[in-house]
């Protein structure tokens, strides 16, 4: 007799997500010498450990300590370049640029990037029918608990003059609603981080408007200045040459605004 | 700009103990919780400690629970990690980071542990 199930409305686990999470971890640390002391078998061990057997709606920051403590690593607290809904000219960036930092460049990013998880109270199985929806369903939820915790460590992290990728061709260019609004923006430490720098990126060829001027833009500059960190803004007109221009900063054509 | 200086290390024998210390400035030392990680030769970065800016909570290692103290002074913007029954394995540079990790950028130059019979 099949057991009663929760059902929930998101998405269930990522098909053969503990071989996927230890792959990753393997390959990370193949990648990255100074991370190959890393046990990746604990790593897993404790990522398991923060939401197995754990009711999927109650998962708590305090559940994923022991895999922060697995994760620690160096971060040039400099070279942090936040994002947000433009995930993927990001990570091209941080490819070319290879000092610079998101957050799926770190271990703990880089094992969770795209993937979805949950478990079930009492039991040690993993859900692979749903999962919680954040809205639907619940915000303490096992993936989203994650991201909020990694990412308000990596927000604390950072010093100096910090940048973020923000998506110049949706409605809302800085949205209060996502990670990058509510969470990292309000854990830069003011005592470390000078200035943050927005970088927004257009999307159409033709597009030659001052998007810095969007009144989210305004907003976000607003919450930042009464945090008493420095705010600046740079219209990436065109990111397919910007992308170019950091691959070979000599080209004659990269000194014209792009 | 953040700063720090450790200090305090040295060649001591298993089972023996050290003190070492962190003196920090640049910032407001105690809204800060600050973390004590190491680094053995040919190893990667590894926390040992967190305390709060407060003092209040504390959080260690495995491998150090119940031989090393980590414990702070705001007043003299200083944070300090008692190491007791020292061991082999404990040979590190040790360093002291602002934050709770697991992103550490260490300012300091550390200081060298070796435990060595």
């Known amino acids: 007799v099949p057991r009663w199930r929760q059902q929930w409305s998101g998405p269930g686990t990522t098909k053969r997500f503990p071989e996927t999470v230890l792959a990753r971890c393997v390959k990370y640390t193949e990648i990255h010498p100074e991370m190959r002391h890393v046990d990746c078998q604990s790593v897993w061990d404790a990522f398991k450990g923060a939401f197995i057997s754990k009711h999927p709606c109650n998962i708590t920051e305090e559940d994923y300590q022991p895999l922060m403590k697995l994760g620690t690593q160096t971060v040039p607290c400099n070279k942090i370049l936040l994002w947000s809904r433009i995930k993927d000219l990001a990570h091209q960036f941080t490819q070319v640029q290879r000092d610079m930092f998101t957050l799926e460049d770190t271990l703990l990013g880089y094992l969770a990037d795209d993937l979805t998880w949950c478990g079930e109270f009492n039991t040690s199985k993993i859900n692979y029918q749903s999962c919680p929806d954040w809205r639907k369903d619940c915000s303490n939820n096992p993936v989203s608990v994650f991201w909020k915790t990694v990412s308000r460590r990596f927000a604390e992290a950072a010093c100096d003059v910090v940048h973020v990728m923000l998506n110049g061709s949706r409605s809302k260019i800085f949205d209060k609603n996502s990670t990058f609004g509510s969470v990292e923006v309000h854990n830069l430490q003011p005592e470390k981080v000078q200035t943050l720098e927005a970088w927004v990126i257009h999307g159409g060829r033709e597009d030659s408007r001052d998007l810095c001027q969007d009144p989210t833009i305004k907003e976000l500059e607003s919450i930042i200045s009464k945090r008493n960190i420095q705010f600046s803004c740079k219209n990436i007109y065109r990111p397919d040459k910007f992308l170019q221009c950091v691959k070979n900063p000599e080209d004659s054509s990269c000194t014209s605004e792009i | 700009e953040v700063q720090v200086l450790e200090s305090g290390g040295g060649l001591v024998q298993p089972g023996g103990s050290l003190r070492l210390s962190c003196a920090a400035s640049g910032f407001t030392f105690s809204n800060f919780a600050m973390s004590w990680v190491r680094q053995a030769p040919g190893k990667g970065l590894e926390w040992v400690s967190t305390?709060?800016?407060?003092?209040?909570?504390?959080d260690y290692a495995d491998s150090v629970k119940g031989r090393f103290t980590i414990s702070r002074d705001n007043s003299k913007k200083t944070l300090y990690l008692q190491m007791n029954s020292l061991r082999v394995e404990d040979t590190a540079v040790y360093y002291c980071?602002?934050?709770?990790?697991?992103?550490?950028?260490?300012r300091g130059q550390g200081t060298l542990v070796t435990v060595s019979s």
């Open positions: 980071a602002d934050g709770r990790g697991p992103f550490f950028d260490y």
């Open positions: 305390i709060s800016g407060s003092a209040g909570t504390t």
